[in-house]
């Protein structure tokens, strides 16, 4: 990605998805009535004109928000503690890697707007998720809906990261 982001960052992202998958506690088939449109800002991760600062910012804010969401008393009561600890550790490592990169990208003079704008959008999205959990009284099904929503949004965000990587590889080889 054009900075000292370790090669295993993509692997860590995939591990996070695997952990979120393993955290499943009840059959999702029981929770259809609790589905909700959280309005994930797809346009933020689907664009073809990917700026390095934008990608870094989206990934950093995503991981920061996931870390916060799964680092609460309510979350500890809902999930298997061993898996939750592994999730926290993995997210913490990825955040450290991304922070190093973000500092470098900002140092290279990339637009501050490319960093602040996605962060605000994602905060609103995650606030909607928190409101939903509270409204549903942190039920097992509410957490299950949120777990699957986070998996979807993280999958889309890491896809965006892979697209930037491919673009960088193509530029490097031409």
């Amino acid at each position: 990605l054009g900075c000292d982001l370790p090669q295993n960052h993509g692997l860590l992202s995939r591990n996070t998805l695997v952990l979120l998958h393993q955290m499943r506690r009840i059959s999702p088939f029981l929770c259809l009535k609790d589905r909700r449109d959280f309005r994930f800002p797809q346009e933020m991760v689907k664009g073809s004109q990917l700026q390095k600062a934008h990608v870094m910012s989206v990934l950093h804010e995503m991981l920061q928000q996931i870390f916060s969401l799964f680092h609460t008393e309510r979350s500890s009561a809902a999930w298997n503690m061993t898996l939750l600890d592994q999730l926290h550790t993995g997210l913490h490592q990825q955040l450290q890697h991304l922070e190093t990169c973000l500092l470098q990208v900002v140092g290279e003079g990339e637009s501050a707007g490319a960093i602040s704008s996605p962060a605000l959008t994602l905060r609103r999205y995650f606030q909607g998720i928190r409101v939903y959990l509270k409204e549903k009284k942190y039920s097992d099904c509410a957490w299950e809906v949120v777990r699957m929503e986070i998996m979807k949004s993280l999958f889309l965000s890491t896809n965006m990261q892979e697209r930037l990587r491919s673009k960088d590889r193509d530029l490097g080889s031409s």
Epitope: R24, P28, C31, R35, D37, V145, M148, E149
Partner: antibody
């Protein structure tokens, strides 16, 4: 391009076994459930059951529980519907369709072309 | 299981007509209702999801409304390609269930 491609038409005798398939492509196969729907000749749509290919968790309509088995092989992005002992009343068109699970997205937005199963002695 | 009842079971209409099909659920399904169109020998096609959301690529003459137990599919101006069978389906709970279908025929 998202596609669900089903296996070809089958002609079987009562008492025989059968396994039909539905192969997904153009999307993350484990991110969507696969549902199966029956349509008997000249009749309406009947929901049979569903599978989450990420872990092969299944749910069946009470009418089809014990009559059929739904399975999936995520390594080849394929879901299956099988019978251990066919009856003449199993003669129908069978469709697979993808479902977004608990994610908010259109339900059953892509369907297979259907597999016609004919059971006759 | 939640029962879905469609009416009418069939109707005859002309090109340009406004057509309305209703679907009633045996218990509240909030807005978890989908509408499908099926033509002979073809797989069903999703038209409307979540009671009123138009599926991508579906013409705007199709619209859906309702919540709770009573739902409506409206075709504002019937086109030749709209002659088909229409099904509603509840999506709030397993087992998913379909209405018996409404066949729209040429008058």
């Amino acid at each position: 391009e998202v596609q669900l491609v089903q296996s070809g038409a089958e002609v079987k005798k009562p008492g025989e076994s059968l396994k039909i398939s539905c192969k997904g492509s153009g999307y993350s196969f484990t991110s969507y459930w696969i549902g199966w729907v029956r349509q008997m000749p000249g009749k309406g749509l009947e929901w049979m059951g569903i599978i989450d290919p990420s872990d092969s968790d299944t749910a069946y309509s009470p009418s089809f529980q014990g009559q059929v088995t739904i399975s999936a092989d995520k390594s080849i992005s394929t879901a299956y519907l099988q019978w251990s002992s066919l009856k003449a009343s199993d003669t129908a068109m069978y469709y697979c369709a993808r479902h977004p699970g608990l994610n908010w997205a259109p339900d059953f937005d892509y369907w297979g072309q259907g597999t016609l199963v004919t059971v006759s002695s | 299981d939640i029962q879905m009842t469609q009416s009418p079971s069939s109707l005859s209409a002309s090109v340009g007509d406004r057509v309305t099909i209703t679907c009633r659920a045996s218990q509240s399904i909030n807005r978890f209702l989908n509408w499908y169109q099926q033509k002979p020998g073809k797989a069903p096609k999703l038209l409307i999801y979540a009671a009123s959301s138009l599926q991508s690529g579906v013409p705007s003459r199709f619209s859906g409304s309702g919540s709770g137990t009573d739902f409506t599919l409206t075709i504002s101006s019937l086109q030749p390609e709209d002659f088909a069978t229409y099904y509603c389906q509840q999506a709030i709970d397993l087992p998913f269930t379909f209405g018996q279908g409404t066949k729209v025929e040429i008058k």
